[in-house]
Interface confidence: medium
């Protein structure tokens, strides 16, 4: 007699390991024989899908190689046209041994920064993740934590955090270990012992000593008055990440010696500096003291501006004063190409006389500053607009550090020619009368906007200036 289908063995929850076989059984009694179909998460499983095997007239569904994505609810439905269709459902829980999907990698990190070593895992049940440093389990503390994701986070990395790490993923089905990775902690260069300053006699030997540390071990270079040391012997030794450098010098002139420790972190460098001065007791070379000396100007840039065979002050804080001061002018000179024709000759005269100051020879050679009135004439008459721009750039730090001498002189700090006519230098290029403006290119308006001081000619002994420039 015809009989409606009855499922005699309802589906149960099946646990299966990845890559293993999982079988659902749906035993049906009926007459005539039923048609049995299978669904996963309400989607029909096709008979020709090669990942499955359906046997025993559809009563056995076998997943041939379980994948993580096979998780879900499986249902069998039986129908033979007699009565209604019947259904039974069961779950497949894919169990998985722990697997490390994003293992940690070698890390180089600078001391004090935050390091994160990744360790992303898969597994069912969800694996717990722990870390091993060297041969011992890693203990978490206020700086070191294992994140929910399994990654290891180290705040404020210290030198002692360097070492070999591996992560361990564990669940009821097994344990997985990552490969061993290296955490390298790099440390900025630091000077442990700075060179000491010395006051020595001319022709003596001095050894400057500089010790530095860092990871990687830094290199030490020595600078003499801003240039690489050109003479002297350097001895170096490295022990326990400490580099020791000794510079032996034969002293023939005063100098500023700087020890620079440098190490590299990826594409960037870190440096530490320490300086010492070498001064010479009774430094009495002819025409020199430890500040500077008088010499004829022999450069090229200021030839047209300075008087022929002018005696200028050369500053011995530079290793090579003539070269250094000439470079300063050389570098600034072309900036003046863009200023107005009214300003340029005045500015050139000011620049050359500011860097190559007139020199008063004597027991102590002395530079003679520019007279305040001449400085003000350049500032407020010839180069009023340009001066504002220069001052703004100086205040905003747009002039490079080597060009500090090129920041415009502060006129108010210069001596007035009324105090002592010999205490300051005039700018011959600006010696003119109000009526004599034709020596400069004409201004746009016929009358200057600033009252021009009567700057005396070099031969004149009268010193009259307009009220605008009278100094008290």
């Amino acid at each position: 007699l015809p009989k409606a289908p009855v499922i005699t063995t309802p589906l149960e929850t099946v646990d299966a390991l990845v890559e293993e076989v999982a079988t659902f059984m749906c035993a049906v009694e009926s007459y005539p024989q039923p048609e049995i179909s299978w669904t996963r998460n309400k989607i029909l499983i096709k008979l020709f899908d090669t990942r499955y095997s359906i046997r025993e007239n559809g009563q056995l569904l076998t997943i041939l190689s379980v994948e993580d994505s096979d998780d879900g609810i499986y249902c069998c439905t039986a129908n033979n046209g007699v009565g209604g269709a019947v259904e039974s459902c069961g779950a497949l829980q894919v169990k998985m041994k722990p697997k490390i999907t994003r293992p940690p990698i070698n890390v180089k990190i600078i001391e004090g920064l935050k390091a994160v070593l990744p360790c992303t895992t898969m597994g069912n049940p969800k694996p717990s993740v722990s870390w091993i440093k060297g041969d011992s389990p890693l203990r978490e503390n206020s700086r070191i934590a294992v994140l929910e994701s399994g990654s290891l986070r180290i705040h404020n990395v210290q030198k002692e955090d360097a070492g070999q790490y591996r992560c361990v993923a564990k669940n009821s089905l097994g344990t997985a270990y990552s490969k061993v990775v290296k955490l390298e902690v790099e440390v900025f260069a630091r000077i442990l012992r700075a060179p000491e300053s010395h006051n020595v006699t001319f022709g003596s030997f001095v050894t400057l000593h500089c010790t530095a540390t860092g990871i990687p071990v830094p290199t030490i270079t020595w600078i003499e008055n801003g240039n690489a040391v050109s003479s002297g012997s350097i001895q170096e030794s490295v022990k326990d990440r400490v580099i020791d450098s000794r510079l032996q010098l034969f002293i023939t002139k005063p100098g500023l010696y700087t020890c620079i420790a440098t190490n590299k972190h990826g594409e960037k460098f870190s440096t530490a500096k320490a300086a010492a001065t070498i001064s010479i007791a009774e430094w009495s070379k002819p025409q020199k003291d430890n500040k500077g000396y008088c010499a004829q100007y022999r450069g090229e840039v200021c030839n047209a501006v300075l008087a022929k065979d002018a005696l200028v002050f050369l500053n011995t804080s530079y290793a090579d004063p003539e070269e250094a001061q000439e470079l300063l002018v050389h570098t600034a000179w072309n900036e003046l190409k863009v200023v107005s024709p009214v300003c340029r000759p005045a500015a050139e005269a000011l620049l050359c006389n500011h860097i190559f100051q007139e020199c008063s020879p004597g027991v102590v050679p002395t530079p003679i500053p520019i007279c305040r009135e001449y400085c003000l004439a350049v500032k407020e008459l010839f180069c009023a607009k340009e001066w504002l721009v220069m001052e703004e750039k100086t205040h905003r730090g747009l002039y490079r550090s080597e060009m500090h001498l090129l920041s415009v002189p502060e006129c108010s700090k210069l001596p007035s020619m009324h105090w002592d006519p010999t205490a300051c230098a005039r700018l011959p290029h600006l010696d003119y009368n109000k009526e004599n403006l034709k020596t400069f290119p004409p201004m746009t308006s016929s009358k200057p906007s600033v009252d021009i001081p009567n700057l005396p000619s070099s031969s004149s002994s009268s010193f009259s200036v307009s009220p605008t420039y009278s100094m008290t």
Epitope: E300, L327, N334, K337, V338, R400, M403
Partner: antibody
Amino acid sequence: ELQLVESGGGLVQPGGSLRLSCAASGFTFDDYGMSWVRQAPGKGLEWVSAIPWNGGSTYYKESVKGRFTISRDNAKKTLYLQMNSLKSEDTAVYYCAKRSGRIAFGALDAWGQGTLVTVSS
Amino acid sequence: QAVVTQEPSLSVSPGGTVTLTCGLSSGSVTASNYPDWYQQTPGQAPRGLIYSTDSRHSGVPSRFSGSISGNKAALTITGAQPEDEADYYCALYMYSDSKLYVFGGGTKLTVL
């Protein structure tokens, strides 16, 4: 006639040393800054080192600092380049060049014909 | 360190005008870089053409001129001649960069 004649080039092994000389004539040698400029085979010009008229300062390209030393003997009208710890990347024709003024930097208005330095094992 | 940039190659017809430029990878070229231009023909030593932006070395034909245009230095050849076919190098004085003198990579000029 102004002339700059370089000499001292040749084949040297990595780590070795060479001293280049540049003999100057036809101008007042001690009135001018001088430079060394090199050119690797098939490549562009590369400034190496400079020295002003009085030899009081020296300037070097970063990659040769500590290995090369520029000097001059104004009495002999000769410019020198002492090259130590040579590397294969130092292989080039080395030109001696005259500055148009006293200081170390600026236009080079006269050049020698160059001397070839080959660093190879 | 800043890199000095030039066009790798340019071409010009005889009698035509061509402008070669010289820039900085970071920042602008200014007169304080004292742009210099050099010419080098195959197998020869370089020779100076232009110094300090716009001054011609002695013996250099007037068809060569230098300038600063925008944020680059420029060398203009007006009325190019077949003998102008050469490599052209610009060089900049970099005071802030350890007092260096830096050459560009060069421009190969072809006079077609």
